[in-house]
């Protein structure tokens, strides 16, 4: 976060003193962002309340100034500036020591690594012969005897420091005003030297010019006056901010200003200045913030206290140790492809002496527009410039050019950019198959825009529903099975196509309405009985273990294995438990099972029953007639059936009292050559019905029925008796 808190130490009059907080964040001060906050933080260092309330003056959305101090004590303590939005919201702290304090810090901000030893040193400004108390965040920490001063300094040594050791430390003479304390700020990075990230397993980029590696994100927090991902570039004198975009006010430039940056940097003088008031210029051979850096220029380079070594022509490098050579753009793709509306990052790498830097690399669009790099990565053998391209249009298709220019010369490389339009379906997806809880869908649809199709996203939800769409990403070449749906429910299904690359997702296509099937009929019937009622007739009964929750009827399946034929009988009445199957093939072995069905779905089958139908018999005997012989005898005569299906084994005669309710009686004529029979033992004056059929392998059809009455008024007979003979 680009946030700087400035204190102008040249101003000693409290009434003129002010603090300024500057945010250089891109898009800072958007209406949705919280405003910058600048205030005195009294939680640790408490002073008397100011004579009048401090007031904030805002200069636009990215700068705020705190004024209104009335007496020196108002200035002593901790000030904080808070800026940035959301997860990037950052607090910058400034610790102000009283110029008239008894004790004064040799160095206010100490940034150390986890596990390091930190030494806080307070030099005596106005001596008192009392003990010195050290405090951490306002709580007692340690006591030193006044005679323990070493060379006029009291030191606190903290070994193996850990992040919780961070905070505000103070050294105070016993019984002296807290305003006379030396206040320090200790910042302990969450990792050891050169490491960052969770578990501290990642390597820092190697921050230059006194930059400090952030232990959470690995970025370099650059000292005021330096920029670049590794703080490798010096700003022009008097400039600061992450991109050198801010300028120190007034003619004195950055003299007398203390700059406080986000942790783990802390505070320092601006580049080229040092001392407790930041008013001392660097000694020869030194440069940078607090003049902490040494030039050590070679090959005739001169030391500039703001930027370091200034190299003569033909040399470059931190110490002018590298000779120049013509820059060269390293391997680049000759053709790249982006999707319309995206804002791609295009990288261009170059080598050369001097090393290409941020401003030396540019990107030219087909319309002649020049883009400057937004980020530069410096590696030992190359500089890679990253260009953030504004939203692409079809007009951006064409030849782009990367250009590099240094004091060693220039180079350029052309490459072709193709801007593609993401695909949008023109048709709805197709339903291939359905079940009660799933739909099989073909997602392949015709589309507008550019291929190839890299992924297909299918969205579906119940018809007329306002719930969120369920999404499934599928292979474009395969059919999709939508699972765990509700039975008998309509679903809207639509497709979104994507092509390769960022922003390759096209819009939604038209939706199709697809309806799931009924729920399965889960009950299994049991076959209870089956009776042959004739050569081609079968009565079947079945049961169900309970009342079906869903079912439209039953399907009886008869499998004739010998002929490889299946007959299906649909009983479209779910309450049915019996059925008469007719028109079967006589003499056939059938395997029979029954299932419950619902809509088009079949439930589990019953165990199969094996049924053997008898073969069919011969046709009916012809010309049957009857003649009464006495009061107890009637003679029956007939002719053989026409074209019997084989040799007749016997005839069966059926006798029944006309109009009676009793069961009929049957008589076998075991000699098939006989076609006449005298039925004896009948009742006198009684009318009888007769019919006859032949048997070959199976029973044949009945003949016509004839009626005849016995004569006279004789005795009741025990029942009919037969006597037969050939006609």
């Amino acid at each position: 976060v680009d946030l700087t808190l400035l204190a102008n130490l040249r101003i000693t009059d409290p009434q003129r003193f002010f603090l300024t907080c500057v945010s250089g964040e891109a898009g800072a001060g958007r209406s949705s962002d919280p405003p910058l906050l600048l205030e005195k933080d009294d939680r640790i260092v408490r002073t008397f309340p100011p004579g009048q309330p401090l007031y904030l003056a805002r200069n636009g959305s990215h700068q705020v100034t705190l004024r209104g101090f009335s007496k020196p004590s108002d200035l002593v303590g901790v000030f904080s500036c808070v800026g940035g939005a959301g997860a990037r919201r950052t607090r910058v702290l400034y610790v102000h020591n009283s110029p008239g304090a008894h004790l004064f810090p040799d160095k206010v901000t100490h940034t150390v690594n986890k596990g390091d030893t930190a030494v806080l040193s307070a030099h005596v400004h106005k001596e008192k012969q009392t003990d010195v108390i050290w405090k951490n965040n306002g709580s007692y920490f340690n006591t030193l005897d006044w005679q323990e001063a070493d060379d006029g300094r009291f030191q606190l040594q903290l070994q193996n420091v850990q992040p919780p050791s961070s905070g505000i430390y103070s050294a105070t003479y016993l019984e002296a005003s807290p305003l006379g304390s030396a206040f320090f700020r200790l910042i302990v990075r969450g990792c050891g030297a050169g490491r960052w990230g969770p578990g501290c397993v990642k390597d820092c980029p190697g921050c230059l010019h006194g930059g400090v590696c952030h232990d959470h994100d690995g970025e370099c927090v650059c000292p005021p006056g330096f920029t670049g991902t590794r703080c490798e570039q010096a700003c022009r004198e008097g400039r600061f901010g992450q991109s050198c975009q801010e300028q120190c006010p007034g003619t004195a430039g950055c003299r007398g200003l203390t700059f406080c940056l986000p942790d783990p940097y802390g505070c320092s003088c601006g580049s080229g200045w040092r001392g407790s008031q930041c008013q001392e210029a660097c000694a020869p051979g030194h440069f940078g913030a607090d003049c902490r850096l040494q030039c050590q220029c070679q090959n005739g380079g001169t030391c500039d206290r703001f930027s370091g070594c200034v190299c003569p022509s033909g040399w470059h490098g931190v110490h002018c140790e590298k000779s120049d050579r013509i820059p060269q753009i390293l391997s680049m793709a000759t053709e790249v492809e982006f999707n319309i509306g995206t804002m791609p990052r295009i990288n261009c790498a170059a080598a050369g002496n001097p090393f290409p830097v941020r401003g030396s690399m540019k990107l030219r669009k087909p319309d002649g527009t020049m883009l400057l790099s937004t980020k530069v990565i410096v590696e030992p053998d190359r500089t890679t410039a990253e260009f953030e391209v504004p939203s692409l249009t079809l007009g951006d298709s064409g030849f782009w050019e990367c250009r590099v220019s240094t004091s060693g010369g220039q180079d350029s490389r052309r490459f072709k950019v193709n801007v593609k339009v993401p695909p949008v379906p023109l048709t709805a997806p197709r339903l291939l198959a359905k079940q009660s809880r799933q739909l099989v869908v073909s997602p392949l649809v015709s589309f507008s825009g550019d291929g190839p199709i890299s992924s297909v996203r299918l969205h579906y939800r119940p018809q007329d529903s306002t719930i969120a769409w369920s999404a499934i990403v599928v292979d474009p070449s395969e059919n999709v099975t939508l699972m765990n749906l509700k039975p008998k429910t309509g679903y809207n299904v639509r497709v979104q196509l994507s092509r390769p690359g960022e922003g390759g997702e096209g819009g939604w296509g038209p939706s199709a309405l697809m309806t799931t099937d009924c729920p399965e009929p889960l009950l299994q019937p049991w076959l209870e009985s089956w009776h042959v009622e004739g050569p081609d007739r079968l009565r079947v009964s079945w049961s169900l273990p309970s009342v079906p929750l869903s079912g439209d009827g039953f399907l009886l399946r008869l499998w004739d294995g010998a002929r490889g034929q299946e007959r299906r009988e649909n009983i479209s009445f779910p309450q049915a438990r019996t059925a008469l199957l007719t028109g079967l093939t006589p003499g056939t072995h059938y395997q029979l099972d029954v299932r419950l069905y619902h809509c088009t779905l079949l439930g589990p089958a019953s165990p199969p029953a094996h049924v053997h139908l008898p073969p069919s018999g011969p046709p009916a005997p012809r010309h049957l007639h009857a003649q009464a012989l006495s009061d107890s005898e009637i003679q029956l005569m007939w002719q053989h059936p026409e074209a019997p299906s084989g040799p007749i084994s016997k005839y069966i005669v059926e006798i029944q009292v006309a109009g009676g309710s009793g069961d009929p009686q049957w008589m076998d004529v075991d000699r098939p050559e006989e076609t006449s029979i005298i039925v004896r033992g009948l009742n006198a004056s009684t009318r009888y019905l007769f019919r006859v059929r032949a048997s070959v392998q199976g029973l044949g059809d009945w003949s016509n029925t004839v009626e005849e009455a016995t004569l006279g008024n004789g005795l009741q007979s025990e029942g009919p008796v037969r006597e037969s003979r050939a006609a």
């Epitope: 009950l523 076959l527 209870e528 049961s543 589990p604």
Partner: antibody, heavy 120, light 107 residues
Framework: EVQLLESGGGLVQPGGSLRLSCAAS????????MVWVRQAPGKGLEWVSV????????GYADSVKGRFTISRDNSKNTLYLQVNSLRAEDTAVYYC?????????????WGQGTLVTVSS | DIQMTQSPLSLSASVGDRVTITCRAS??????LAWYQQKPGKVPKLLIY???TLQSGVPSRFSGSGSGTDFTLTINSLQPEDVATYYC?????????FGQGTRLDIK
């Protein structure tokens, strides 16, 4: 508590016969279909036979059709498997299990099994 | 008869792994499928019935899915006590055939 207890297993010569029984308790026996499942030593499960609650409807695996007969006596809460013409490959633990009444297709209740060994 | 084919026939996995066993029917069987677990010397135990319904008392790391011809048993985070042989069985039509079984052990 539903319990199924098989008995009748033992050593028998090829071509011999046995009658396996399964005594059921803890549920209304006449309301449930019953099955026999077998498992040869070190091998997988093999479905053998089923009988309907009334006993009128039976089914068999092809490997035992014509040799095994399943029956039940609802008055005695007992399931039977008459095994004839035994072969070496019929050596297995024979389990009886209660068939589902519908909806929940799976055998939840099993007996502990009875071992049939066919060997000369 | 409907054939049930399980794959793999054996597999080794580490504790905490996600394990998937598949069962394929030679013809469509709707949702009429059960999964069993059998430990050595023990009676089979019903895990999943009607393809995806978890039997009461079975840990929720077990789940079943599929319909028609392709079915899956998934163990979300393998535990040492899950070492066993797993069988599928179809209930669509008689004979109610089982798969060959999948032997699962711990690496």
């Amino acid at each position: 508590e539903v319990q199924l207890l098989e008995s009748g297993g033992g050593l028998v010569q090829p071509g011999g016969s046995l009658r396996l029984s399964c005594a059921a308790s803890g549920f209304t026996f006449s309301m449930y279909g019953m099955v026999w499942v077998r498992q040869a030593p070190g091998k997988g499960l093999e479905w053998v036979s089923v009988i309907s609650p009334s006993g009128g409807n039976t089914g068999y695996a092809d490997s035992v059709k014509g040799r095994f007969t399943i029956s039940r006596d609802n008055s005695k809460n007992t399931l039977y498997l008459q095994v004839n013409s035994l072969r070496a490959e019929d050596t297995a633990v024979y389990y009886c299990a209660r068939a589902p009444r519908g909806y929940s297709y799976g055998y939840y209740y099993w007996g502990q099994g009875t071992l049939v060994t066919v060997s000369s | 008869d409907i054939q049930m084919t399980q794959s793999p026939l054996s597999l080794s996995a580490s504790v905490g792994d996600r394990v998937t066993i598949t069962c394929r029917a030679s013809q469509g069987i709707g949702h009429y499928l059960a999964w069993y677990q059998q430990k050595p010397g023990k009676v089979p135990k019903l895990l999943i019935y009607t393809a995806s319904t978890l039997q009461s008392g079975v840990p929720s790391r077990f789940s079943g899915s599929g319909s028609g011809t392709d079915f899956t048993l998934t163990i979300n985070s393998l535990q040492p006590e899950d070492v066993a042989t797993y069988y599928c069985q179809q209930f669509n039509s008689y004979p109610h055939t089982f798969g060959q079984g999948t032997r699962l052990d711990i690496k």
